[in-house]
Interface confidence: low
């Protein structure tokens, strides 16, 4: 799978999930998250080789395609597949509230 | 929706389905399929500017994040949204088979 | 596509209530982080921030109307009801509502506002 | 409160000039700063925020800059379409409006 336990170890130049860290005052200009300052959003990138896991048979064959017509700007692209929540703390006025933001961290990719 | 009906009649930049003709024999090397000998799979491609057709919180986040730091690596990827089937003519021998091959066409794209 | 709409009286007599409803849809006022504002603007005058909901109800209001403000969320129905009261002349003004997102600060999409006169 | 304070309230232009147009906030607002440019009869439409961020669809001769208190909307070559009216936003604290600065055809 192409998800952070394999990515983060190795030098992979295809389709994989890199680290991000968002910090969210400087990055987003999110005043209202307290806690808490950042987390790693991490996202996907790196090039979609044929089968590389291919999310359906369109992108099965869209990279067949590519592999076939290299000129061709029609190729499948690397997306998060796999992402997880995460827990923030902000303030309503003075009273602390503590939501769970859903499909926030990126755990890991695949070629769609 | 970022699908046909909308993205084959204007000339839109960003994130969008594009029509794309595929011919078996020719373009991917399947002489197996008897019929049809081609079909439109389409593409998406274009730029995910942020909020455009966001597929979850992390692309909403990860958009605005390419918006305020235009020369970070990291941004949303144009992607198939909603797919249909395919109904193919084959032979095994020279018994003809019909078969529906799923996820094979692009009707729209989301930013992922 | 995201589309707000502003729905009221066009005329209300001084010191009547005024209740605004901003029907929207293409998002929903249930997702972290989502806000719908209000804005007003005075015939060729300026623009004017009156009040604000979030998702999590949490609300904001202009400093110098804000004891005669109300604002609400009916978020199965999406809209948002604000309510002015005590009107006066001074208030005639075309009452815009629209959608703020993440907490950004500012307004992306806008209604196409709505003109209320306040005469006897 | 926050004062927005937009330079000048109008001014005269022809197509192809270069517009720049100011707004100085009462007080340090970091870059909490949003441009609108409206239309006679029309609702506002956000052209830029956090002060330098361009907003998807709007063409590339809108650009925004400045930080704290001083900030600048400047329109590299003026179309016939930009005759309108400009407002600044801060929202920093609350949301303030600028008074708007109007455009003409010289």
């Known amino acids: 799978a192409l998800d952070t336990n394999y990515c983060f170890r190795n030098l992979e130049e295809n389709c994989c999930v890199r680290p991000l860290y968002i910090d969210f005052r400087q990055d987003l200009g999110w005043k209202w998250v307290h806690e808490p300052k950042g987390y790693y959003a991490n996202f996907c990138s790196g090039p979609c080789p044929y089968l590389r896991s291919a999310d359906t048979t369109h992108s099965t064959v869209l990279g067949l395609y590519n592999t076939l017509n290299p000129e061709a700007s029609a190729s499948p692209c690397c997306v998060p597949q796999d992402l997880e929540p995460l827990t923030i703390l902000y303030y309503v006025g003075r009273t602390p509230k503590v939501e769970q933001l859903s499909n926030m961290v990126v755990k890991s990719c695949k070629c769609s | 929706a970022l699908d046909t009906n909308y993205c084959f009649r204007n000339l839109e930049e960003n994130c969008c389905v594009r029509p794309l003709y595929i011919d078996f024999r020719q373009d991917l090397g399947w002489k197996w399929v008897h019929e049809p000998k081609g079909y439109y799979a389409n593409f998406c491609s274009g730029p995910c500017p942020y909020l455009r057709s966001a597929d979850t919180t992390h692309s909403t986040v990860l958009g605005l994040y390419n918006t305020l730091n235009p020369e970070a690596s990291a941004s949303p990827c144009c992607v198939p949204q909603d797919l249909e089937p395919l109904t193919i003519l084959y032979y095994v021998g020279r018994t003809p088979k019909v078969e529906q091959l799923s996820n094979m066409v692009v009707k729209s794209c989301k930013c992922s | 596509q995201v589309t707000l709409r502003e729905s009221g009286p066009a005329l209300v007599k001084p010191t009547q209530t005024l209740t605004l409803t901003c029907t929207f849809s293409?998002?929903?006022?249930?997702?972290?982080?989502?806000?719908v504002g209000w804005i007003r603007q005075p015939p060729g005058k300026a623009l004017e921030w009156l009040a604000h909901?979030?998702?999590?109800?949490?609300?904001s209001y202009s400093t110098s109307l804000k004891t005669r403000l109300t604002i609400s969320k009916d978020t199965s129905k999406n809209q948002v009801v604000l309510t002015m009261t005590n009107m006066d002349p001074v208030d005639t003004a075309t009452y815009y509502c629209?959608?703020?997102?993440?907490?950004?600060?500012?307004?992306?999409?806008w209604g196409q506002g709505t003109l209320v006169t306040v005469s006897s | 409160d926050i004062q927005m304070t937009q330079s000048p309230s109008s001014l005269s232009a022809s197509v192809g000039d270069r517009v720049t147009i100011t707004c100085r906030a009462s007080q340090d607002i970091s870059n909490y700063l949003n441009w609108y440019q409206q239309k006679p009869g029309k609702a506002p439409k956000l052209l830029i925020f956090g002060a330098s961020s361009l907003q998807s669809g709007v063409p590339s001769r809108f650009s925004g800059s400045g930080s704290g208190t001083d900030f600048t909307l400047t329109i590299s070559s003026l179309q016939p379409e930009d005759f309108a009216t400009y407002y600044c936003?801060?929202?920093?604290?609350?949301?303030?409006f600028g008074q708007g600065t109007k455009v003409e055809i010289k």
């Open positions: 629209a959608r703020d997102f993440y907490y950004s600060g500012y307004f992306d999409s």
């Open positions: 909901i979030y998702w999590n109800d949490d609300k």
């Open positions: 293409g998002f929903s006022l249930s997702t972290s982080g989502m806000g």
């Open positions: 936003q801060q929202t920093n604290t609350m949301n303030t």
